[in-house]
Interface confidence: low
């Protein structure tokens, strides 16, 4: 009897109720391999999912995410809201960086602005949600007659975290 079932091709199942006859998969189900005793229910692409490939008798449906979302997980098992610079990814989606923090890359979380005063420098350019502060000369260097010994520190290259 097992041999009879192994002859059932993809798109069918071995129907025990009908003397192991190969029956077609019912609507909204599929079998991607031969010799199956049941057909699997087709995946339904609803809500934030949209159908990329319709279900057939031999293959499951494939989903993408609607505009403004991107796929996560193997086989696009989840849709996550698109993130931007100035945001961080949390389990609840993308959140704006809190004041005093920034994220200049597509990965990672919001990080605190550099504390210029720790290096004895002053803030030359204020930080934003997307960019770190730029530290300039120390306040003492800005007094009359003083010359700047070092140029302002360059902003970090976007897309990279400090090493």
């Amino acid at each position: 009897l097992q041999d009879l079932c192994s002859n059932c091709p993809a798109g069918t199942f071995c129907d025990n109720n009908r003397s192991q006859i190969c029956s077609p998969c019912p609507p909204n189900s599929f079998s991607s391999a031969g010799g199956q005793r049941t057909c699997d229910i087709c995946r339904q692409c609803k809500g934030v999912f949209k159908t990329r490939k319709e279900c057939s008798s031999t293959s499951n449906a494939e989903c993408d995410c609607i505009s403004g979302y991107h796929c996560l997980g193997a086989e696009c098992s989840m849709c996550e809201q698109d993130c931007k610079q100035g945001q961080e990814l949390t389990k609840k989606g993308c959140k704006d960086c809190c004041f005093g923090t920034f994220n200049d890359q597509k990965r990672g979380i919001c990080r605190p602005w550099t504390n210029c005063s720790l290096d004895g420098k002053s803030v030359l350019v204020n930080g934003t949600k997307e960019r770190d502060v730029v530290c300039g000369p120390s306040p003492a260097d800005l007094s009359p007659g003083a010359s700047s010994a070092t140029p302002p520190a360059p902003a970090r290259e976007p897309g990279h975290s400090p090493q």
Epitope: H70, C71, L72, G73, L89, T90, Q105, K106, R107, S161
Partner: antibody, heavy 118, light 108 residues
Framework: EVQLLESGGGLVQPGGSLRLSCAAS????????MSWVRQAPGKGLEWVSD????????DYADSVKGRFTISRDNSKNTLYLQMNSLRAEDTAVYYC???????????WGQGTLVTVSS | EIVLTQSPGTLSLSPGERATLSCRAS???????LAWYQQKPGQAPRLLIY???SRATGIPDRFSGSGSGTDFTLTISRLEPEDFAVYYC?????????FGQGTKVEIK
């Protein structure tokens, strides 16, 4: 079925160039970040580079920065890695992988071997 | 750069035994950004766990991940013959993306 198929590997002399390709199928290529990851013989995995879905944002490991260039052609569903000024330490199997960003690399190609030797 | 250190380097066990693999990060990593892979000789890596504890599609439930901060663990509750392979952890918390050096699970 998602498939990634690398090609373009081979033997090249130090200082030479190679261009790797990765043909993607079975998913909406233009919606995903893509990465190159390499593995030297008998060693572990090393991330090399990634590129965003539009091809406008790229990032590189320090070890290849300035020598390698990642690019993509969404009309051809193909990812590329142009490798210049190759060194012996670049010898590795190079994998392309679909990059889910936070959630890792869910699909990988079979790899293509690049050997840099005189 | 976030350095991931895996231990032990090699784990010698018998089928049916429990395997516990460790991955320690040099700085705190959000658990959302930690993944585990399995690699067999001559094959590409295979995603097992993402988000530190979520199983990828098609991965048997004998594989589980846990941890947060700097310490993460991959557990194989009962080793099957096909589970003997090299396992890597990986972080995508910040650039550059990094992998651990790997743990080889071999048959005792």
């Amino acid at each position: 079925e998602v498939q990634l198929l690398e090609s373009g590997g081979g033997l090249v002399q130090p200082g030479g160039s190679l261009r790797l390709s990765c043909a993607a199928s079975g998913f909406t290529f233009s919606s995903y970040d893509m990465s190159w990851v390499r593995q030297a013989p008998g060693k572990g995995l090393e991330w090399v580079s990634d590129i965003d879905p539009t091809g406008s944002k790229t990032d590189y490991a320090d070890s290849v920065k300035g020598r390698f260039t990642i690019s993509r052609d969404n009309s051809k569903n193909t990812l590329y890695l142009q490798m210049n000024s190759l060194r012996a330490e670049d010898t590795a199997v190079y994998y392309c992988a679909r990059d889910l960003m936070v959630y890792g690399f869910d699909y990988w190609g079979q790899g293509t071997l690049v050997t840099v030797s005189s | 750069e976030i350095v991931l250190t895996q231990s032990p380097g090699t784990l010698s066990l018998s089928p049916g035994e429990r395997a516990t693999l460790s991955c320690r990060a040099s700085q705190s990593v959000s658990s959302s950004y930690l993944a585990w892979y399995q690699q067999k000789p001559g094959q590409a890596p295979r995603l097992l766990i993402y988000g530190a504890s979520s199983r990828a599609t098609g991965i048997p439930d004998r594989f589980s991940g846990s941890g947060s901060g700097t310490d993460f663990t991959l557990t194989i509750s009962r080793l099957e013959p096909e589970d003997f392979a090299v396992y890597y952890c990986q972080q995508s918390y910040s650039y550059p993306v990094t992998f651990g050096q790997g743990t080889k699970v071999e048959i005792k």
